[in-house]
Interface confidence: low
Protein backbone atom coordinates (compact mmCIF):
# COMPACT_ATOMS: atom_id res chain seq x y z
CA UNK A 1 0.00 0.00 0.00
CA UNK A 2 2.77 2.43 0.92
CA UNK A 3 4.69 1.54 -2.25
CA UNK A 4 1.63 2.18 -4.43
CA UNK A 5 0.96 5.47 -2.75
CA UNK A 6 4.51 6.71 -3.20
CA UNK A 7 4.48 5.77 -6.89
CA UNK A 8 1.38 7.91 -7.32
CA UNK A 9 3.00 10.84 -5.53
CA UNK A 10 4.53 13.15 -8.17
CA UNK A 11 6.82 14.63 -5.50
CA UNK A 12 8.65 11.32 -5.10
CA UNK A 13 10.20 11.90 -8.54
CA UNK A 14 11.91 15.15 -7.51
CA UNK A 15 15.63 14.52 -7.01
CA UNK A 16 17.99 16.11 -4.48
CA UNK A 17 18.69 19.72 -5.45
CA UNK A 18 15.03 20.29 -6.34
CA UNK A 19 11.75 20.68 -4.52
CA UNK A 20 8.21 19.71 -5.33
CA UNK A 21 6.68 23.08 -6.13
CA UNK A 22 3.05 23.25 -5.03
CA UNK A 23 2.74 26.66 -6.67
CA UNK A 24 3.56 25.08 -10.00
CA UNK A 25 1.34 22.03 -10.00
CA UNK A 26 3.93 19.93 -8.14
CA UNK A 27 6.63 20.12 -10.79
CA UNK A 28 10.23 19.69 -9.65
CA UNK A 29 11.79 23.15 -9.41
CA UNK A 30 15.50 23.74 -8.76
CA UNK A 31 16.34 24.97 -5.29
CA UNK A 32 16.63 28.77 -5.32
CA UNK A 33 20.05 30.36 -4.75
CA UNK A 34 21.42 29.89 -1.19
CA UNK A 35 19.22 26.88 -0.52
CA UNK A 36 19.56 23.11 -0.87
CA UNK A 37 17.74 19.78 -0.62
CA UNK A 38 19.93 16.82 0.26
CA UNK A 39 17.25 14.19 -0.40
CA UNK A 40 14.65 13.60 -3.07
CA UNK A 41 10.94 14.19 -2.69
CA UNK A 42 11.31 17.41 -0.67
CA UNK A 43 8.50 19.94 -0.63
CA UNK A 44 10.84 22.78 0.33
CA UNK A 45 14.55 23.52 0.12
CA UNK A 46 16.46 24.42 3.26
CA UNK A 47 18.30 27.71 3.60
CA UNK A 48 22.07 27.32 3.38
CA UNK A 49 24.01 27.88 6.55
CA UNK A 50 26.01 31.11 6.40
CA UNK A 51 29.47 31.15 7.94
CA UNK A 52 29.72 34.68 9.29
CA UNK A 53 31.80 36.51 11.85
CA UNK A 54 33.98 34.11 13.80
CA UNK A 55 32.80 31.25 11.55
CA UNK A 56 34.46 30.71 8.19
CA UNK A 57 33.37 28.55 5.27
CA UNK A 58 34.98 25.11 5.13
CA UNK A 59 32.69 23.83 2.36
CA UNK A 60 30.45 25.94 0.16
CA UNK A 61 26.72 25.27 -0.02
CA UNK A 62 25.55 23.46 -3.14
CA UNK A 63 22.05 22.69 -4.37
CA UNK A 64 22.31 19.26 -2.71
CA UNK A 65 24.35 19.90 0.45
CA UNK A 66 24.57 22.51 3.17
CA UNK A 67 27.60 24.69 3.75
CA UNK A 68 30.02 23.58 6.46
CA UNK A 69 31.72 26.05 8.77
CA UNK A 70 34.81 26.01 10.91
CA UNK A 71 36.31 28.74 13.09
CA UNK A 72 38.73 31.56 12.34
CA UNK A 73 42.27 31.25 13.75
CA UNK A 74 42.37 31.63 17.50
CA UNK A 75 39.03 29.84 17.91
CA UNK A 76 37.93 26.21 17.82
CA UNK A 77 34.68 24.45 17.01
CA UNK A 78 32.20 23.29 19.64
CA UNK A 79 29.13 21.17 19.29
CA UNK A 80 27.47 19.24 16.54
CA UNK A 81 28.51 20.48 13.10
CA UNK A 82 30.64 23.26 14.59
CA UNK A 83 27.57 25.04 15.95
CA UNK A 84 29.75 27.37 18.00
CA UNK A 85 33.27 28.77 18.09
CA UNK A 86 35.14 29.19 21.34
CA UNK A 87 38.33 31.13 21.99
CA UNK A 88 41.61 29.21 22.13
CA UNK A 89 43.86 29.57 25.15
CA UNK A 90 47.55 28.72 25.46
CA UNK A 91 48.80 25.45 26.85
CA UNK A 92 48.94 25.83 30.61
CA UNK A 93 45.70 27.83 30.63
CA UNK A 94 41.95 27.26 30.69
CA UNK A 95 39.07 29.38 29.49
CA UNK A 96 36.95 30.91 32.26
CA UNK A 97 34.27 33.57 32.16
CA UNK A 98 37.04 36.12 32.76
CA UNK A 99 39.04 34.88 29.78
CA UNK A 100 42.11 32.65 29.61
CA UNK A 101 43.60 31.99 33.04
CA UNK A 102 46.77 30.10 34.00
CA UNK A 103 46.30 26.65 35.50
CA UNK A 104 46.42 26.64 39.29
CA UNK A 105 49.42 24.96 40.94
CA UNK A 106 48.93 21.22 40.88
CA UNK A 107 47.00 21.24 37.59
CA UNK A 108 47.95 21.26 33.91
CA UNK A 109 46.50 21.62 30.43
CA UNK A 110 48.53 20.42 27.43
CA UNK A 111 46.02 21.70 24.86
CA UNK A 112 44.72 25.04 23.58
CA UNK A 113 41.23 24.05 24.70
CA UNK A 114 39.75 22.31 27.72
CA UNK A 115 40.20 22.69 31.42
CA UNK A 116 43.18 22.32 33.72
CA UNK A 117 43.38 18.81 35.12
CA UNK A 118 45.02 17.70 38.36
CA UNK A 119 48.49 16.21 38.12
CA UNK A 120 48.58 12.45 38.50
CA UNK A 121 49.04 11.42 42.12
CA UNK A 122 51.90 8.95 41.69
CA UNK A 123 51.65 7.72 45.27
CA UNK A 124 48.19 6.28 44.58
CA UNK A 125 49.90 3.73 42.32
CA UNK A 126 52.70 3.23 44.81
CA UNK A 127 55.07 5.21 42.59
CA UNK A 128 57.15 8.33 43.02
CA UNK A 129 57.47 11.53 40.99
CA UNK A 130 60.19 11.12 38.37
CA UNK A 131 59.57 14.44 36.57
CA UNK A 132 57.72 17.28 38.24
CA UNK A 133 54.53 18.57 36.68
CA UNK A 134 54.15 22.03 35.15
CA UNK A 135 51.15 24.09 34.03
CA UNK A 136 51.55 22.49 30.59
CA UNK A 137 52.54 18.93 31.48
CA UNK A 138 51.49 16.19 33.86
CA UNK A 139 54.00 14.70 36.28
CA UNK A 140 55.90 11.62 35.15
CA UNK A 141 55.69 8.78 37.63
CA UNK A 142 58.69 6.56 38.21
CA UNK A 143 59.55 3.49 40.25
CA UNK A 144 58.01 2.96 43.66
CA UNK A 145 59.69 4.77 46.57
CA UNK A 146 60.93 1.40 47.85
CA UNK A 147 62.97 1.03 44.68
CA UNK A 148 64.66 4.38 45.23
CA UNK A 149 67.80 5.04 47.24
CA UNK A 150 67.22 6.21 50.85
CA UNK A 151 66.28 9.83 51.20
CA UNK A 152 64.51 10.13 47.86
CA UNK A 153 61.22 11.98 48.15
CA UNK A 154 57.89 11.38 46.53
CA UNK A 155 55.79 14.45 47.09
CA UNK A 156 52.76 15.11 44.94
CA UNK A 157 50.49 18.00 46.01
CA UNK A 158 46.85 17.13 46.48
CA UNK A 159 44.69 17.77 43.44
CA UNK A 160 42.91 21.08 43.97
CA UNK A 161 39.16 21.37 43.64
CA UNK A 162 38.45 22.62 40.18
CA UNK A 163 35.67 24.59 38.63
CA UNK A 164 33.79 22.06 36.52
CA UNK A 165 33.17 22.13 32.83
CA UNK A 166 29.61 21.14 33.06
CA UNK A 167 27.76 24.04 31.89
CA UNK A 168 24.55 23.17 30.25
CA UNK A 169 23.65 24.65 27.08
Amino acid sequence: FERTRSLQDPCSNCPAGTFCDNNRNQICSPCPPNSFSSAGGQRTCDICRQCKGVFRTRKECSSTSNAECDCTPGFHCLGAGCSMCEQDCKQGQELTKKGCKDCCFGTFNDQKRGICRPWTNCSLDGKSVLVNGTKERDVVCGPSPADLSPGASSVTPPAPAREPGHSPQ
Epitope: G79, M84, T96, R162, P164, G165, H166, S167, P168, Q169
Partner: antibody, heavy 121, light 107 residues
Framework: QVQLVQSGAEVKKPGSSVKLSCKAS????????INWVKQAPGQGLEWIGN????????NYNQKFKDKATLTVDKSTSTAYMELSSLRSEDTAVYYC??????????????WGQGTTLTVSS | DIQMTQSPSSLSASLGERVTITCKAS??????LSWFQQKPGKAPKTLIY???RLVDGVPSRFSGSGSGQDFTLTISSLQPEDIATYYC?????????FGGGTKVEIK
Protein backbone atom coordinates in the same frame (compact mmCIF):
# COMPACT_ATOMS: atom_id res chain seq x y z
CA GLN B 1 25.98 10.19 14.57
CA VAL B 2 25.93 11.15 18.24
CA GLN B 3 23.46 9.16 20.33
CA LEU B 4 22.66 8.81 24.02
CA VAL B 5 20.50 5.74 24.61
CA GLN B 6 18.97 5.32 28.04
CA SER B 7 17.77 2.15 29.75
CA GLY B 8 14.09 1.23 29.82
CA ALA B 9 11.33 2.21 32.23
CA GLU B 10 11.60 0.95 35.81
CA VAL B 11 9.00 0.25 38.50
CA LYS B 12 10.45 0.01 42.00
CA LYS B 13 9.27 -0.41 45.58
CA PRO B 14 9.89 2.32 48.17
CA GLY B 15 13.19 1.82 49.97
CA SER B 16 14.84 -0.03 47.09
CA SER B 17 17.54 1.22 44.71
CA VAL B 18 17.78 1.50 40.94
CA LYS B 19 20.65 2.01 38.49
CA LEU B 20 19.84 3.87 35.29
CA SER B 21 22.19 3.75 32.32
CA CYS B 22 23.02 6.08 29.43
CA LYS B 23 25.05 4.56 26.59
CA ALA B 24 26.91 7.02 24.40
CA SER B 25 28.02 6.50 20.81
CA UNK B 26 29.23 8.56 17.87
CA UNK B 27 31.73 10.72 19.76
CA UNK B 28 34.72 10.56 22.12
CA UNK B 29 32.96 9.61 25.35
CA UNK B 30 35.73 10.75 27.68
CA UNK B 31 35.79 14.32 26.33
CA UNK B 32 32.27 15.39 27.28
CA UNK B 33 30.47 15.74 30.59
CA ILE B 34 27.39 13.62 31.14
CA ASN B 35 24.69 15.49 33.07
CA TRP B 36 21.57 14.03 34.65
CA VAL B 37 18.31 15.96 34.81
CA LYS B 38 15.11 15.06 36.66
CA GLN B 39 11.58 15.88 35.53
CA ALA B 40 8.81 14.85 37.92
CA PRO B 41 5.31 14.34 36.41
CA GLY B 42 3.89 17.67 35.27
CA GLN B 43 6.86 19.45 36.82
CA GLY B 44 9.88 21.39 35.63
CA LEU B 45 13.52 20.37 35.25
CA GLU B 46 16.13 19.85 37.97
CA TRP B 47 19.85 19.34 37.45
CA ILE B 48 21.05 16.39 39.53
CA GLY B 49 24.77 16.41 38.77
CA ASN B 50 27.38 15.54 36.19
CA UNK B 51 30.44 13.40 35.64
CA UNK B 52 33.50 13.78 33.41
CA UNK B 53 34.24 10.30 32.08
CA UNK B 54 37.95 10.91 31.53
CA UNK B 55 38.66 10.99 35.27
CA UNK B 56 35.20 10.39 36.85
CA UNK B 57 35.20 13.87 38.36
CA UNK B 58 31.67 14.58 39.64
CA ASN B 59 29.57 17.56 40.68
CA TYR B 60 26.30 17.10 42.55
CA ASN B 61 23.35 19.30 43.30
CA GLN B 62 23.38 19.29 47.12
CA LYS B 63 19.69 18.33 47.02
CA PHE B 64 20.61 14.99 45.38
CA LYS B 65 23.93 14.37 47.13
CA ASP B 66 22.55 11.53 49.28
CA LYS B 67 20.17 10.27 46.60
CA ALA B 68 22.22 9.90 43.42
CA THR B 69 25.59 8.33 42.68
CA LEU B 70 27.10 8.95 39.25
CA THR B 71 29.60 6.56 37.68
CA VAL B 72 30.91 5.70 34.23
CA ASP B 73 32.30 2.65 32.48
CA LYS B 74 34.69 3.98 29.85
CA SER B 75 35.12 0.53 28.27
CA THR B 76 31.46 0.53 27.22
CA SER B 77 31.00 4.34 26.93
CA THR B 78 28.18 4.12 29.45
CA ALA B 79 27.23 6.50 32.25
CA TYR B 80 25.21 5.31 35.22
CA MET B 81 23.12 6.97 37.89
CA GLU B 82 22.16 4.95 40.95
CA LEU B 83 19.25 6.25 43.02
CA SER B 84 18.98 4.87 46.54
CA SER B 85 16.31 4.73 49.29
CA LEU B 86 13.60 5.32 46.73
CA ARG B 87 10.47 7.23 47.70
CA SER B 88 7.35 8.19 45.78
CA GLU B 89 8.80 11.66 45.12
CA ASP B 90 11.58 10.04 43.08
CA THR B 91 8.95 9.11 40.48
CA ALA B 92 10.06 11.05 37.41
CA VAL B 93 11.60 10.95 33.95
CA TYR B 94 15.40 11.08 34.20
CA TYR B 95 17.38 12.42 31.25
CA CYS B 96 21.07 12.18 30.51
CA UNK B 97 22.53 14.91 28.37
CA UNK B 98 26.04 15.76 27.31
CA UNK B 99 27.98 19.00 27.45
CA UNK B 100 31.50 19.66 26.31
CA UNK B 101 34.15 20.38 28.85
CA UNK B 102 34.08 24.17 28.54
CA UNK B 103 32.08 25.48 31.43
CA UNK B 104 30.86 28.86 30.37
CA UNK B 105 29.79 28.44 26.78
CA UNK B 106 28.50 24.92 26.87
CA UNK B 107 25.22 23.62 25.57
CA UNK B 108 23.23 20.47 26.33
CA UNK B 109 23.53 19.53 22.68
CA UNK B 110 22.41 15.90 22.78
CA TRP B 111 19.92 14.24 25.11
CA GLY B 112 18.88 10.69 25.87
CA GLN B 113 15.26 9.75 25.32
CA GLY B 114 14.63 9.68 29.08
CA THR B 115 14.00 6.84 31.52
CA THR B 116 10.71 6.76 33.40
CA LEU B 117 11.06 5.65 37.01
CA THR B 118 7.92 4.83 38.98
CA VAL B 119 8.22 4.26 42.72
CA SER B 120 5.12 2.60 44.11
CA SER B 121 4.24 0.05 46.76
CA ASP C 1 21.16 28.14 45.15
CA ILE C 2 20.20 30.79 42.63
CA GLN C 3 16.43 31.00 42.14
CA MET C 4 15.04 31.56 38.64
CA THR C 5 11.57 33.08 38.46
CA GLN C 6 9.92 32.66 35.07
CA SER C 7 6.79 34.45 33.92
CA PRO C 8 4.14 33.99 32.82
CA SER C 9 3.60 30.36 33.75
CA SER C 10 1.38 29.99 30.69
CA LEU C 11 0.25 32.14 27.82
CA SER C 12 -2.07 31.91 24.86
CA ALA C 13 -1.21 33.76 21.65
CA SER C 14 -2.34 33.89 18.04
CA LEU C 15 -0.28 32.55 15.16
CA GLY C 16 2.03 35.28 13.89
CA GLU C 17 1.89 37.13 17.20
CA ARG C 18 5.01 38.27 19.06
CA VAL C 19 5.55 36.30 22.27
CA THR C 20 7.75 37.37 25.19
CA ILE C 21 8.79 35.23 28.17
CA THR C 22 10.84 36.63 31.04
CA CYS C 23 13.18 35.10 33.57
CA LYS C 24 14.49 36.82 36.69
CA ALA C 25 17.48 35.56 38.66
CA SER C 26 17.75 36.00 42.41
CA UNK C 27 21.25 37.44 41.91
CA UNK C 28 23.50 38.65 39.11
CA UNK C 29 24.29 35.76 36.75
CA UNK C 30 26.19 37.81 34.13
CA UNK C 31 25.00 36.42 30.78
CA UNK C 32 25.15 32.75 31.77
CA LEU C 33 21.59 31.90 30.86
CA SER C 34 20.12 29.42 28.38
CA TRP C 35 16.63 28.91 27.02
CA PHE C 36 15.12 25.50 26.25
CA GLN C 37 12.06 24.32 24.37
CA GLN C 38 10.33 21.11 25.45
CA LYS C 39 7.47 19.43 23.61
CA PRO C 40 5.27 16.85 25.37
CA GLY C 41 6.98 13.48 25.81
CA LYS C 42 10.25 14.76 24.35
CA ALA C 43 13.61 15.77 25.77
CA PRO C 44 14.28 19.51 25.99
CA LYS C 45 16.12 21.25 23.17
CA THR C 46 18.50 24.18 23.64
CA LEU C 47 17.54 27.33 21.74
CA ILE C 48 19.83 29.99 23.17
CA TYR C 49 22.96 30.11 25.32
CA UNK C 50 24.87 33.00 26.87
CA UNK C 51 21.57 34.94 27.04
CA UNK C 52 21.47 35.90 23.36
CA ARG C 53 23.42 33.41 21.24
CA LEU C 54 21.26 31.30 18.98
CA VAL C 55 22.20 27.63 18.71
CA ASP C 56 22.86 26.67 15.11
CA GLY C 57 19.74 25.42 13.35
CA VAL C 58 17.29 27.26 15.61
CA PRO C 59 14.97 29.56 13.60
CA SER C 60 15.88 33.25 13.71
CA ARG C 61 12.40 34.14 15.03
CA PHE C 62 13.76 33.12 18.43
CA SER C 63 15.93 35.68 20.19
CA GLY C 64 17.22 36.24 23.68
CA SER C 65 18.26 39.36 25.55
CA GLY C 66 19.25 40.57 28.98
CA SER C 67 22.12 40.33 31.43
CA GLY C 68 22.59 40.53 35.16
CA GLN C 69 19.26 39.47 36.64
CA ASP C 70 16.62 40.07 33.95
CA PHE C 71 16.32 38.06 30.76
CA THR C 72 13.83 37.73 27.93
CA LEU C 73 13.06 35.12 25.28
CA THR C 74 11.15 36.51 22.29
CA ILE C 75 9.41 34.63 19.50
CA SER C 76 8.92 37.31 16.85
CA SER C 77 6.11 35.53 15.01
CA LEU C 78 4.53 32.50 16.70
CA GLN C 79 4.36 29.38 14.50
CA PRO C 80 2.35 26.17 15.11
CA GLU C 81 5.56 24.22 15.78
CA ASP C 82 6.47 26.63 18.61
CA ILE C 83 3.73 25.19 20.85
CA ALA C 84 5.75 23.88 23.77
CA THR C 85 6.95 24.64 27.28
CA TYR C 86 9.96 26.95 27.55
CA TYR C 87 12.50 26.92 30.37
CA CYS C 88 15.34 29.21 31.30
CA UNK C 89 18.47 27.90 33.02
CA UNK C 90 21.23 29.77 34.83
CA UNK C 91 24.73 28.31 34.80
CA UNK C 92 26.70 31.10 36.43
CA UNK C 93 26.93 29.03 39.60
CA UNK C 94 26.59 25.40 40.55
CA UNK C 95 24.10 23.94 40.74
CA UNK C 96 22.57 25.14 37.50
CA UNK C 97 18.94 25.97 38.16
CA PHE C 98 15.93 26.09 35.84
CA GLY C 99 12.99 28.45 35.81
CA GLY C 100 9.56 26.97 36.44
CA GLY C 101 8.59 26.92 32.76
CA THR C 102 6.17 28.79 30.49
CA LYS C 103 3.58 26.82 28.55
CA VAL C 104 2.82 28.45 25.18
CA GLU C 105 -0.51 27.65 23.53
CA ILE C 106 -2.39 28.83 20.46
CA LYS C 107 -5.31 31.17 21.03
Amino acid sequence: QVQLVQSGAEVKKPGSSVKLSCKASGYTFSSYWINWVKQAPGQGLEWIGNIYPSDSYTNYNQKFKDKATLTVDKSTSTAYMELSSLRSEDTAVYYCTRTWEFYYDSVFDYWGQGTTLTVSS
Amino acid sequence: DIQMTQSPSSLSASLGERVTITCKASQDINSYLSWFQQKPGKAPKTLIYRANRLVDGVPSRFSGSGSGQDFTLTISSLQPEDIATYYCLQYDELPPTFGGGTKVEIK
